[in-house]
Amino acid sequence: SSPTSSASSFSSSAPFLASAVSAQPPLPDQCPALCECSEAARTVKCVNRNLTEVPTDLPAYVRNLFLTGNQLAVLPAGAFARRPPLAELAALNLSGSRLDEVRAGAFEHLPSLRQLDLSHNPLADLSPFAFSGSNASVSAPSPLVELILNHIVPPEDERQNRSFEGMVVAALLAGRALQGLRRLELASNHFLYLPRDVLAQLPSLRHLDLSNNSLVSLTYVSFRNLTHLESLHLEDNALKVLHNGTLAELQGLPHIRVFLDNNPWVCDCHMADMVTWLKETEVVQGKDRLTCAYPEKMRNRVLLELNSADLDCDPILPPSLQTS
C-alpha cells in the first residue's frame, strides 16, 4: 500500500495523493506530497517545490533527504523529530531553501546524521545550540562528520547586532558536540577574521574550507591541534602575508595540503620568510601561481621567483621629515 515504486526509480507524490488517503493517518512509508521517493535508494527528494515547511510525513526509511530550493524560512526545535524517529537519516541537504533562522535542537533525534548542508541560506539567526541541541556545557556528541555552511551570510541589513563570525563559531563550539567533525566548509561568508578558539576545539577536522572570505590575517589562528588536517582552503581571501608562527604550524601538520590562490599578497620585507618557506615546502598546492598584488612595482610578480633583494620596505621617516 506504499506509493513508493520498486527498484531504484523515484515515485512522485502527486498533490492529489494526500487527499486520496486523507481520512486515515498518513501511511508510514508514503511519499510526501511534492516529493519524489525511492525506497530502494533510501532517498527522498523535495527539490525546488517552494515547500514552506519540512514535511511531517517523511518515510521512516529515508537515508538521504534533499530539501533544496524551497522556502522553509525557519527550522524549529525538533524539525526532523518523528515517531518513530528517522533513525537512518544520514545525509540532509537544505541548501538554497531561504532559511533565515535555525533554532536550538533543530537536528535533534537524528542519531545517524553524518552530513548536513545548510549552504546558500541567509542565516541571520543561527542558534548557538543548533547543532548541539542543548545548552549544557558539554552536550552529547553529535554524529555529524561533515558540515557544509558555504554562503550562509545574510544581507547586511538582515544581520543581527552581533558578529556573524561569532554567531557561527558559537554554534560550532557549543557543548563541544562537534568533536567528531571531519569536514567543515565555511566558504563565501565574508568572514573578516577567524576566532582563535574555533580550530582548537575541532580536533578531528580533515578538511577545512575558508575560501572566498575576507580574511586579512591568520596571526591569531592556531592550527597546531589539527593533526589530522588534510586540506586547508584559503583561496580568494584578503591575506597579505603568512607569518613565521603560521608557517611553522602548517609545516608541522603531517598530511596537510594548503590552497592559497588569489590573495592580495604584499611583497615587501615582511614577505621574506613566507617566500623562503614557499620555496622549500611541499604543502602549498599550486604555489607557482601565487603572485604579488602590492606594492605597485611588484604587481603580478611570482612569489617563488622573488629573492630577498626584491623584498624591501620603504623606510619610515621621522615625523619631522614626513611630507603631507
Partner: antibody
Framework: EVQLVESGGGLVQPGGSLRLSCAAS????????MNWVRQAPGKGLEWVSY????????YYADSVKGRFTISRDNAKNSLYLQMNSLRDEDTAVYYC??????????????WGRGTLVTVSS | DIQMTQSPSSLSASVGDRVTITCRAS??????LNWFQQKPGKAPNLLIY???ILQSGVPSRFSGSGSGTDFTLTISSLQPEDFATYYC?????????FGGGTKVEIK
Amino acid sequence: EVQLVESGGGLVQPGGSLRLSCAASGFTFSSYSMNWVRQAPGKGLEWVSYINSVSNTIYYADSVKGRFTISRDNAKNSLYLQMNSLRDEDTAVYYCARGGVRVLRSYFDLWGRGTLVTVSS
Amino acid sequence: DIQMTQSPSSLSASVGDRVTITCRASQTISSYLNWFQQKPGKAPNLLIYTTSILQSGVPSRFSGSGSGTDFTLTISSLQPEDFATYYCQQSYSTPLTFGGGTKVEIK
C-alpha cells in the same frame, strides 16, 4: 464572499466518533494552510490541529494526538477533522481558521462561525 | 510548550479611556505574537499580527508593541464596539498557544 462554514457538530457519547467539515469559499483554498481551534463553554481558545496546503505537514495539540485526524480535499475546498475516542473535555465549539504559508510565524486571519460538539452520556 | 499569560483577566473602562492589555510568554517568541478580539457568541477576529501589524480593516486606535517575552495591546480611545474579550496567541513554535483572555467591560 470570503468565508468558512463548519458543520458536523452534535451530541456524542464518550468514546464515540464525529467528523467535522469546513467548507471554504471566496478564496483559493489550495493556497492556504488551515487549522482547527476550539473553545470550551465559558473558556478560552485552544489550538487543536494544523495542515498545510498540500497535506504533507500536519501538527496536533498533545491533548488530541492519536485521537483526532485532520485532512483536506483541495478539489472540494474542504477541511475535515475526524474525532475518535471522544472525551467529556472535548466538548467545545470547534472553529476552522485559515493560516498562512506555514504553521510558524503565521496568524489566523479568517474564521468560521464554529460548530458545537457536546460529549456527554 | 510556551505558556501565554494575559493580564488583567478582566477590566472595567469607560468610552474614551486608554486601555492597555499585557501578554507575557514563558520563553522568547521573538515578534511572533498575534491579538484577537472576540464578542459573545461570535468567532474571534484578528486585530494585530506579528506584534504590531494592524490587520486590514482594523481601526488605528488599536496598536501592539513588545518583543521577546513581553507584549502589549493598546486601545488609545475605547469605543462602545470595543467591549469584548481579547486574546493573545504565539506562533513561534508548536503547539500554538493562546493567552487566557482579557474581558473588557463597561464601567
